[in-house]
């Protein structure tokens, strides 16, 4: 049909973090390059129907379905999704093509299905069909990488049995300590599975796919470094491969390295050596100890000895199941309003944990740092001095761990008041939780010094706002105080705050707030 317009259907994936729901739109967002969806004429269909290639979207991903129409004159359009009509606003691009877009933000199950776009041009009417489904990530896995020796070569292969196929990269660093942080200029990344340069200070292999990124560090004993105060410890699960690298540098080549397990030399086939001359004919030797699949009897002290360096050992512990060891008792802290403070959890875990910090139903990224004693630590400092309950949650393949923290911020009370026909109530959120006094203002007591003790009902911590306790005090109205001004005061060790209430009729009052330090 010569009258049929030239149309193009594209999918645009967005890197946005908006949280709105699907809407027909033409506004730009941060996006990746468009993907052509084909849009072929559907055969044997009544009317002119174009069908775009099926679209698979990750949960929470944001996309735009877009149609570009090369047809003369104006066009009008209508989107239909699950029998509901959705507004459609076509516009024209620089090439004078009609552009119709449907933006789906934060993809959910309810937004999956068939999207029909009806377009009416001066020449003809036609329909475009998009089928959007959620990608099944239940089958996805991301496994921690492990090492294997390359056959007949002095090289390591990094393997991660993950779905979809991960991108594997080696992360190498030749500096010590802090300068080996991921984004440091000292860090070199090599996107390949095989590594021949095995003499570096710090060697890690990382695998990444749609589920994230997992890394494994090549466990190293460096005989030129001062040994840690506590023996380094390596945990492995039964069946996993063991790799330990012993590294030593000497002024010349005249030295050798050996591995022993519990004072017994490792069997041939369980180690291999490499050496290289560094500058000034200094020699670096590395000796790998490896077991392709560990059993319980591979547990023990592995000692690397040199003819020119003091020996160093590592304790290898083979476990049946992963673990997370930490104290899970809840902890309460009280700090001043401007005091620097961080929550911290010290734990020992294998395999490495994934963790989050949560406050007020919002999750925060969790960083973990290895300590010299085999423990790791996670700190959270981003509390912005908001009191309440903070939760640390950690998990690995075999274990879960949750720890609760309560943060109280020391401050003087702030009082809010409300009144009804039968009672007046005051609320305060200061910490330590305040005590209350009610005073009556009268001719006899213009300064409101006459204390009210009858009909007062204090409730400490009657309302929890994200773990923040609120104290309240209620005064039941009696004939003796009706029509009078009363003052409720909340006080703690940091000060006092008062609110004055006229006890006559219900409704909002022009309360007068006094702040007395």
């Amino acid at each position: 049909n010569q009258d049929l317009p030239v149309i193009k259907c594209v999918l645009i994936n967005h890197k946005n973090n908006d949280s709105s729901v699907g809407k027909s739109s033409s506004y730009p967002m941060v996006s990746e390059s468009p993907e052509d969806l084909g849009c072929a004429l559907r055969p044997q269909s009544s009317g002119t129907v174009y069908e775009a290639a099926a679209v698979e979207v990750d949960v929470s991903a944001s996309i735009t379905l877009q149609v570009l129409v090369d047809a003369p004159g104006n066009i009008s359009c209508l989107w239909v999704f699950k029998h509901s009509s959705l507004n459609c606003q076509p516009h024209f691009d620089l090439q004078n093509r009609g552009v119709v877009s449907m933006v789906i933000l934060k993809m959910t199950e309810t937004q999956a299905g068939e999207y029909l776009l009806f377009i009416q041009s001066e020449a003809t009417n036609y329909t475009i069909l998009f089928t959007v489904s959620i990608r099944n990530t239940l089958l996805y896995t991301l496994r921690r990488p492990y090492f294997r020796k390359m056959e007949n070569q002095d090289a390591l292969v990094c393997i991660s049995e993950s779905v979809p196929e991960p991108i594997v990269e080696w992360v190498l660093c030749d500096s010590q300590g802090e300068s080996c942080k991921e984004e440091s200029p000292a860090v070199v990344k090599k996107e390949e599975k095989v590594l021949h340069e095995l003499f570096g200070t710090d060697i890690r292999c990382c695998a990444r796919n749609e589920l994230g990124r997992e890394c494994t560090r090549l466990f190293t004993i460096d005989l030129n470094q001062t040994p840690q105060t506590t023996l380094p410890q390596l945990f492995l699960k039964v069946g996993e491969p063991l790799w330990i690298r012993c590294k030593a540098v000497h002024v010349n080549h005249g030295f050798g390295l050996t591995w022993e397990l519990e004072n017994k030399a490792l069997e041939e086939g369980n180690y291999f050596e490499m050496s290289t001359y560094s500058t000034n004919r200094t020699m670096i030797r590395i000796l790998f100890a490896f077991v392709s699949s560990v059993a319980r009897n591979d547990t023990g002290y592995y000692t690397c000895s040199s003819s020119k360096h003091p020996s160093q050992s590592a304790l290898v512990t083979i476990v049946e199941k992963g673990f997370i060891n930490a104290t899970n008792s809840s902890e309460d802290y009280e700090i001043d309003q401007y005091e620097e403070f961080c929550f911290s959890v010290r734990f020992k875990a294998y395999p490495q944990i994934r963790c989050t910090w949560t406050f007020s139903r919002k999750s925060f990224p969790c960083e973990q740092k290895g300590l010299d004693n085999g423990y790791s630590i996670s700190k959270f400092c981003n509390h912005k001095h908001q009191p309440g309950e903070y939760i640390f949650h950690a998990e690995n393949d075999d274990a879960q761990f949750t720890k609760m923290f309560t943060l109280n911020i020391r401050r003087k009370p702030q009082v809010l008041a409300e009144a009804s026909a039968s009672q007046a109530s005051c609320f305060s959120d200061g910490y330590p939780l305040p005590s209350w006094t009610w005073k009556k203002c009268s001719d006899k007591s213009p300064n409101c010094t006459e204390e009210i003790t009858e009909g007062v009902w204090n409730r400490k911590a009657n309302r929890k706002v994200f773990g923040q306790w609120v104290s309240s005090s209620t005064l039941n109205m009696s004939e003796a105080i009706k029509g009078f001004l009363v003052k409720c005061c909340a006080y703690n060790s940091l000060g006092t705050s008062c609110e004055t209430i006229l006890l006559n009729s219900p409704g909002p009052f022009p309360f007068i707030q006094d702040n007395i330090s």
Epitope: V251, H253, S275, T276, N280, R281
Partner: antibody, heavy 117, light 110 residues
Framework: QVQLQESGPGLVKPSQTLSLTCTVS??????????WSWVRQSPGKGLEWIGE???????NYNPSLKSRVTISVDKPKNQLSLKLGSVTAADTAVYYC?????????WGQGTLVTVSS | QSVVTQPPSVSAAPGQKVTISCSGS????????VSWYQQLPGTAPKVLIY???VRPSGIPDRFSGSKSGTSATLGITGLQTGDEADYYC???????????FGGGTQLIVL
């Protein structure tokens, strides 16, 4: 069996740059555990160490030649090269490349370079 | 002028024993390994001894090496006419960060 073969012009004019290549066969120039050196021998004189290069790319040079010498490696071509600038008649010599480890275990057969106008 | 010195020449009759000395300082011979090379006329040098006293395979046990303090010695017993050649010691200088050859010794078999 590792073999080293020097190549380059036999005659270089004074003040020009002497360039030699050493092609390694039967083994990889990237093999760990070795460094690669250039040594020369003026007619009727003893052996003179010029310099050496390590797997890392680090180099050491004879202080008397340091300002004029560059040693480099082309790993894909499995070649070692020597450049010596601003040559004079005193640079006339047989130039050897050698593989170093515990000792120089493999040597090229040497190539005579004459500096003359 | 070499920092590591050798006698210009030594001579002995066939079947005799000869020693060639190599003298340096603490920064070279004193703290580093010494190797010895034989250079027959018109050929590239060939190693005889490395790591002060180790013979590579294929080198007859007539050749031996030793080191004491800042001096090294190459010993050849049962001299043969085929031993007539130039002999060089080689070491590393840790202060200068350079390799260095001795000036060379011509062995004459009388």
């Amino acid at each position: 069996q590792v073999q080293l073969q020097e190549s380059g012009p036999g005659l270089v004019k004074p003040s020009q740059t002497l360039s030699l290549t050493c092609t390694v066969s039967g083994g990889s120039i990237s093999s760990s555990g070795y460094y690669w050196s250039w040594v020369r021998q003026s007619p009727g004189k003893g052996l003179e160490w010029i310099g050496e290069i390590y797997q890392s790319g680090n180099t050491n040079y004879n202080p008397s030649l340091k300002s004029r010498v560059t040693i480099s490696v082309d790993k894909p071509k499995n070649q070692l090269s020597l450049k010596l600038g601003s040559v004079t008649a005193a640079d006339t010599a047989v130039y050897y490349c050698a593989r170093g480890g515990s000792y120089y275990d493999y040597w090229g057969q040497g190539t005579l370079v004459t500096v003359s106008s | 002028q070499s920092v590591v010195t050798q006698p210009p020449s030594v001579s002995a009759a066939p079947g005799q024993k000869v020693t060639i000395s190599c003298s340096g300082s603490n920064s070279n011979i004193g703290n580093n390994y010494v190797s010895w090379y034989q250079q027959l006329p018109g050929t590239a040098p060939k190693v005889l001894i490395y790591d002060n006293n180790v013979r590579p395979s294929g080198i007859p046990d007539r050749f031996s090496g030793s080191k004491s303090g800042t001096s090294a010695t190459l010993g050849i017993t049962g001299l043969q006419t085929g031993d007539e050649a130039d002999y060089y010691c080689e070491t590393w200088d840790s202060s200068l960060n350079v390799g260095m050859f001795g000036g060379g010794t011509q062995l004459i078999v009388l």
